[in-house]
Interface confidence: low
């Protein structure tokens, strides 16, 4: 073969030209329209897993490939028919027109064409196999897409039901909010009404207060007048008494002028015939200085001088050294009689000390010391106690041996703190010790876990603050 050329004609059909000597043979072959050229950009694995948006694209590609296969098959059949027809015609022509040696050439060309056809068929078979592989792969991908789609559909359904639930909840809440708004409006209206009523009430009260203020002014004036009248009356009474005593003395010279009786303690008051509980004026030993004290003439035989009382928290017991020295409070209520008086009194003769206690549960107890006295101020009113009996604990809640008295401004305790400041009140603090009857007064339900309350450890334990306490003294030989 001098020349064998493959080219394209103007209408795009493939033509095979064979040059043999002076003869050239041209074969026009039918062209496939839908055949993809080898250079077309096609990626076999272009379908992406779990990408439902490319599902339609994959189906379309599959259809295209099926069409290509069908067209290839048709083209092969056409090619075979075409070759057979041409061969018949050419063979007849060759037999008729050509010389004997041309027959050989034609047979060779025919063989050549058949070889080419076989080659083409093999190639197409390969293409078919590739297409089948690609089809299988696409089918698998389609299956994956199908599963992915199912999953997505399920999720969408779930989400839809969730959305429906939320919508229901939302509508329920909206209703609730509307109901609340209505309620709120009603409440606001009632509040406004109440406010108006209160304003009326306030204005009424203001007018009442004004009237009362006027009355108070008048009462104050009247009170001043009454006080003056009372003073004048007292003066008149005193004058009369003086006149009477003078006239009596003149009548009976044997009756000496009666000396005013003074009492050192409530035991003396009791012995003098005053057996009623109350406030009496007592006189310091070896002095004319007086002090008012409450006398208990009923408890345990009477004659008790009350030196301390707590009952309602009405008196502040966080006082100075001087205040504890001279006494403070109200003898008919909460009070401290005074360390100086008690010290002088208890150093004159032997006294007993009774401490009466009440808790918040209605229980009562007492501690009785058979000997009690306080040292002088120079020794910081140190407490001395002996012989404990009673129901408020077998161990003394006042530390033994006795300690010096301490106040917020007189720190004489055995502590590296200031017990009086920490626990409040003046007391015979140790470090700081198991008692403090002058601590903070705590009302009921606030009286537990209080380290600075009214404490008597060996009766009520740690942190319990008592309801009421009374400290009373009486001569041991009463």
């Amino acid at each position: 073969y001098n020349n064998f050329r493959k080219s394209m004609d103007s209408i795009g059909k493939k033509q095979y030209q064979v040059q043999h000597g002076s003869c050239s043979y041209t074969f026009l072959l039918p062209e496939m329209d839908n055949c993809r050229s080898s250079s077309s950009p096609y990626v076999s694995n272009a379908v992406q897993r779990d990408a439902p948006l490319e599902y339609d694209d994959s189906v379309q590609r599959l259809q295209v490939l099926e069409n290509i296969m069908e067209n290839n098959t048709q083209w092969l059949m056409k090619l075979e028919n075409y070759i057979q027809d041409n061969m018949k015609k050419e063979m007849v022509e060759i037999q008729q027109n050509a010389v004997q040696n041309q027959t050989a050439v034609m047979i060779e060309i025919g063989t050549n064409l058949l070889n080419q056809t076989a080659e083409q068929t093999r190639k197409l078979t390969d293409v078919e196999a590739q297409v089948l592989n690609q089809t299988t792969r696409l089918e698998l991908q389609l299956l994956e897409h199908s599963l992915s789609t199912n999953k997505l559909e399920k999720q969408i359904l779930d989400q839809t039901s969730e959305i429906n639930k939320l919508q229901d909840k939302n509508s329920f809440l909206e209703k609730k909010v509307l109901a609340m708004e209505d309620k709120h409006i009603i409440q606001l209206q009632s509040i406004k009404e109440e406010k108006d009523q209160l304003q009326v009430l306030v204005s009424k009260q203001n007018s009442i207060i004004e009237e009362l203020e006027k009355k108070i002014v008048t009462a104050t004036v009247n009170n001043s007048v009454l006080q003056k009248q009372q003073h004048d009356l007292m003066e008149t009474v005193n004058n009369l008494l003086t006149m009477m005593s003078t006239s009596n003395s003149a009548k009976d010279p044997t009756v000496a002028k009666e000396e005013q009786i003074s009492f050192r303690d409530c035991a003396e008051v009791f012995k003098s015939g005053h057996t009623t509980n109350g406030i009496y004026t007592l006189t310091f030993p070896n002095s004319t200085e007086e002090i008012k004290a409450y006398c208990d003439m009923e408890a345990g035989g009477g004659g008790w001088t009350i030196i301390q009382r707590r009952e309602d928290g009405s008196v502040d017991f966080q006082r100075t050294w001087k205040e504890y020295k001279v006494g403070f409070g109200n003898p008919s209520g909460e009070y401290w009689l005074g360390n100086e008086f008690v010290s002088q009194l208890t150093n004159q003769q032997r006294y007993v000390l009774k401490i009466h206690l009440k808790d918040w549960e209605g229980n009562e107890a007492y501690s009785l010391y058979e000997h009690f006295y306080l040292s002088s101020e120079e020794l910081n009113y140190r407490i001395h106690l002996k012989g404990l009996t009673g129901t408020a604990g077998k161990i003394s809640s006042i530390s033994q041996p006795g300690n010096d008295f301490s106040t917020k401004d007189g720190d004489n305790d055995k502590c590296i703190c200031k017990c009086s400041q920490m626990l409040t009140g003046g007391w015979w603090f140790d470090a700081c010790g198991p008692s403090n009857l002058n601590g903070m007064y705590y009302p009921q339900r606030q009286n537990t876990n209080k380290f600075n309350g009214i404490k008597w450890y060996y009766w009520k334990g740690s942190g319990y603050s008592l309801k009421a306490t009374t400290m009373m003294i009486r001569p041991a030989d009463f």
Epitope: K414, I416, A431
Partner: antibody, heavy 121, light 107 residues
Framework: QVQLVESGGGVVQPGRSLRLSCAAS????????MHWVRQAPGKGLEWVAV????????YYADSVKGRFTISRDNSKNTLYLQMNSLRAEDTAVYYC??????????????WGQGTTVTVSS | DIQMTQSPSSLSASVGDRVTITCRAS??????LGWYQQKPGKAPKRLIY???SLQSGVPSRFSGSGSGTEFTLTISSLQPEDFATYYC?????????FGQGTKVEIK
């Protein structure tokens, strides 16, 4: 709750210094006396120093007098022990302790977990 | 300085035993004495204050007695958790002083 936490321990050469700290929480630190107590390895407890609630008074064991200084910062709720001229015999676990307690001031009631001081060359 | 002498320095006992530890002060300290329990690697824990007052939360099998110079700590019925070292402390004056300790071991 009431808590004391010591810090500042470590290994130090003889003659050198160290400062221990004790952080207090859960109680009114400024109202209570504070102590340092130590325990040498395998030995008993030894009281070291005390400082009054307001820092006005300080006492020391004879073994540390002139070398150790106890101090406090009530604004920081912290107790300190400045240890100078350290000796091998100062090797111990150092505890800070407070006089806080139920019927407090009856000796040390609240203790820290301790910090170890080792004096070695 | 007040010296505190504790005895014995160690003792072996069984669970359920009654144990007594004594502490002697070199001078009178009223009732200004506390008893402490210490377990290995732990901080001391106060059992008794004011010689005979039981610290809150401490079992009643522990008790203290004495005044002046002679003091006693008693464990009425020893329990497994009671095996530890016990110290007395005087807080009557500074410097405060501990006893040398009593180690209670299992027999």
């Amino acid at each position: 709750q009431v808590q004391l936490v010591e810090s500042g321990g470590g290994v130090v050469q003889p003659g050198r210094s160290l400062r221990l700290s004790c952080a207090a929480s859960g109680f009114t630190f400024s109202s209570f006396g504070m102590h340092w107590v130590r325990q040498a390895p395998g030995k008993g407890l030894e009281w070291v120093a005390v400082i009054w609630f307001d820092g006005s008074n300080k006492y020391y064991a004879d073994s540390v007098k002139g070398r150790f200084t106890i101090s406090r910062d009530n604004s920081k709720n912290t107790l300190y022990l400045q240890m100078n001229s350290l000796r091998a015999e100062d090797t111990a676990v150092y505890y800070c302790a407070s006089d806080y307690g139920d019927y407090f001031y009856y000796g040390m009631d609240v203790w820290g977990q301790g910090t170890t001081v080792t004096v070695s060359s | 300085d007040i010296q505190m002498t504790q005895s014995p320095s160690s003792l072996s006992a069984s669970v359920g035993d009654r144990v007594t530890i004594t502490c002697r002060a070199s001078q009178g300290i009223r009732n200004d004495l506390g008893w402490y329990q210490q377990k290995p690697g732990k901080a001391p824990k106060r059992l008794i204050y004011a010689a005979s007052s039981l610290q809150s939360g401490v079992p009643s099998r522990f008790s203290g007695s004495g005044s002046g110079t002679e003091f006693t700590l008693t464990i009425s019925s020893l329990q497994p958790e009671d095996f530890a070292t016990y110290y007395c402390l005087q807080y009557n004056s500074y410097p405060r002083t501990f006893g040398q300790g009593t180690k209670v071991e299992i027999k």
